[in-house]
Amino acid sequence: IPPHVQKSVNNDMMVTDNNGAVKFPQLCKFCDVRFSTCDNQKSCLSNCSITSICEKPQEVCVAVWRKNDENITLETVCHDPKLPYHDFILEDAASPKCIMKEKKKPGETFFMCSCSSDECNDNIIFSEEYNTSNPD
């Protein structure tokens, strides 16, 4: 970190990687919740035209696919993996790909994935061959 760039503000240390370099934020698709036509496919594109620089360097990309009796939605955001999202821990946040895993939610089918490469939540993967662990 160069000396002229403040290392600490209000005791909040700048995020650095393990060689001391400043951690730069990643890029994520960020359309919040949109209606989706993604259904019964091995993978889908988000169809989100908004790519944002995540606000915080520690944030990762997240996608949430939900289906109920009325519609299908896809949510794309940046989120801090230290914090739960929709009451679930982002256990796959270090993955370079967004591999969807089903979560238990009453009244709907709910899949979520997180990943840590640029725009990785643009391509969401449901295919079983990628899933090495059982859904929650």
């Epitope: 990687d17 060689n19 400043v22 730069f24």
Partner: nanobody, 122 residues
Framework: EVQLLESGGGLVQPGGSLRLSCAAS???????QMWWVRQAPGKGLEFIS?????????YYADSVKGRFTISRDNSKNTLYLQMNSLRAEDTAVYYC???????????????WGQGTLVTVSS
């Protein structure tokens, strides 16, 4: 030796415009991803814009989207930030920055200019 030198900062009224420049040397500028990062008084770093190379794709933080434009002139080894519709909350030191892999997976060296101060006030 990598050097990044920002210029173009100053005092501007709300609603005004400024164009920042960053002169780069010591590396192959035309192949590098470049960033503009700012630090408001008493605040942390805010990464506001990135431009890739090749291709020149540009990205913005929500706080500046639609108001700021990042660009580069590879023939002049210079990075630019055009700032329009400036607000008081844009007051900050603006840095240009680059990073390159260390060779160890997932880690980077980062390089920073000395910064240029932008003050938006009436």
């Amino acid at each position: 030796e990598v050097q990044l030198l920002e210029s173009g900062g100053g005092l501007v009224q709300p609603g005004g415009s400024l164009r920042l420049s960053c002169a780069a040397s010591g590396f192959t500028f035309g192949t590098e991803q470049m960033w503009w990062v700012r630090q408001a008084p008493g605040k942390g770093l805010e990464f506001i814009s990135r431009i890739d190379s090749p291709g020149g794709r540009t990205y913005y933080a929500d706080s500046v989207k639609g108001r700021f434009t990042i660009s580069r002139d590879n023939s002049k080894n210079t990075l630019y930030l055009q700032m329009n519709s400036l607000r008081a909350e844009d007051t900050a030191v603006y840095y240009c920055a680059k990073r390159r892999p260390t060779g160890v997976s997932g880690t980077f060296y980062d390089y920073w200019g000395q910064g240029t101060l932008v003050t938006v006030s009436s």
